[in-house]
């Protein structure tokens, strides 16, 4: 067995509606049947969990209903979307992939995607 590497884009710009999407790709060293994907946010030296989902290979990944994340999976690639972002949420978002089953367990951590969020300017009052 060898190390698992995780790739993700260096920079992503959120849309004006506060939505950011990026791909998290991992090189699976084994035949995993159960995979857990976690999005972490690193600000200074503090790391917090944004969202997480476990899925069985071949099935869709499902986040909790109240999660700000959605995603789809295709092979060793996960397409992640984070919603409801505001300027204060600008930061480094790290993709963490765990191959949970069968053993051995593998952990892979991406270098992080810097997500820039710009709050939209409020519409000026119109005289018309």
């Amino acid at each position: 067995c060898k190390a698992m590497h995780v790739a993700q884009p260096a920079v992503v710009l959120a849309s004006s509606r506060g939505i950011a999407s990026f791909v998290c790709e991992y090189a699976s060293p084994g035949k995993a049947t159960e995979v857990r994907v976690t999005v972490l946010r690193q600000a200074d030296s503090q790391v917090t969990e944004v969202c997480a989902a476990t899925y069985m290979m071949g099935n869709e990944l499902t986040f909790l209903d109240d999660s700000i994340c959605t995603g789809t999976s295709s092979g060793n690639q996960v397409n992640l979307t984070i919603q409801g972002l505001r300027a204060m949420d600008t930061g480094l978002y790290i993709c963490k992939v765990e191959l949970m089953y069968p053993p051995p367990y593998y952990l892979g951590i991406g270098n992080g995607t810097q997500i820039y969020v710009i709050d939209p300017e409020p519409c000026p009052d119109s005289d018309f």
């Epitope: 067995c1 190390a3 995780v6 790391v47 790290i94 963490k96 051995p104 367990y105 593998y106 892979g108």
Partner: antibody
Framework: QVQLVESGGGVVQPGRSLRLSCAAS????????MHWVRQAPGKGLEWVAV????????HYADSVKGRATISRDNSKNTLYLQMNSLRAEDTAVYYC???????????WGQGTLVTVSS | EIVLTQSPGTLSLSPGERATLSCRAS???????LAWYQQKPGQAPRLLIY???SRATGIPDRFSGSGSGTDFTLTISRLEPEDFAVYYC?????????FGPGTKVDIK
């Protein structure tokens, strides 16, 4: 601040069992994976076992597989290690440690000494 | 399991000198999953470096980590009296997680 306090160590005869406990405070226990690491007298560190934050996943070192059970009670902020069929080579200081979100261990207890001897 | 080998076993140096400690893995380890710990006699270990090169909170910048694949290095740029201790590397990328046997840094 983060505190991990181990208990349950002592002298035990070969073949007997022992349960170690670790009382955690100063952080949200239910959000962290927890590990046991041991150190035989005058020797290096040996990773023993890990349990996920919710207890859903557990892994063990080959040296204790089949003899050790790691468990946790999130309502009591307590981690456990049940060791059965103890051997002389299980003699060590057992450390309770906290896992961080990025996978590494960042806090250690002061350890509890287990001596397996007849 | 991944076997970690540390060298040298003992490093005898004087305060102010540079210490270079090596950790070699029996197979490739993700650089995101390699940590270094310091242990002084009678004390629990303390996290120094995680992710091969990230300093833990409160660790002085004289400690630095580098490496990838199977070869990793911990460097102490200028040894202070409190740095004389045993240093362990650990991989946490593949279960079972494993520690190296340690390198003792003592005063020459």
């Amino acid at each position: 601040q983060v505190q991990l306090v181990e208990s349950g160590g002592g002298v035990v005869q070969p073949g007997r069992s022992l349960r170690l406990s670790c009382a955690a405070s100063g952080f949200t226990f239910s959000s962290h994976g927890m590990h046991w690491v041991r150190q035989a007298p005058g020797k290096g560190l040996e990773w023993v076992a890990v349990t996920w934050y919710d207890g859903s996943n557990k892994h063990y070192a080959d040296s204790v597989k089949g003899r050790a059970t790691i468990s946790r009670d999130n309502s009591k902020n307590t981690l456990y290690l049940q060791m059965n069929s103890l051997r002389a080579e299980d003699t060590a200081v057992y450390y309770c440690t906290r896992g961080e979100l990025l996978g590494y261990v960042d806090y250690w207890g002061q350890g509890t000494l287990v001596t397996v001897s007849s | 399991e991944i076997v970690l080998t540390q060298s040298p076993g003992t490093l005898s140096l004087s305060p102010g000198e540079r210490a270079t400690l090596s950790c070699r893995a029996s197979q490739s380890v993700s650089s995101s999953c390699l940590a270094w710990y310091q242990q002084k006699p009678g004390q629990a270990p303390r996290l120094l470096i995680y992710g091969a090169s990230s300093r833990a909170t409160g660790i002085p910048d004289r400690f630095s980590g580098s490496g990838s694949g199977t070869d990793f290095t911990l460097t102490i740029s200028r040894l202070e009296p409190e740095d004389f201790a045993v240093y362990y590397c650990q991989q946490y990328g593949i279960s079972p997680f494993t520690f190296g046997p340690g390198t003792k840094v003592d005063i020459k």
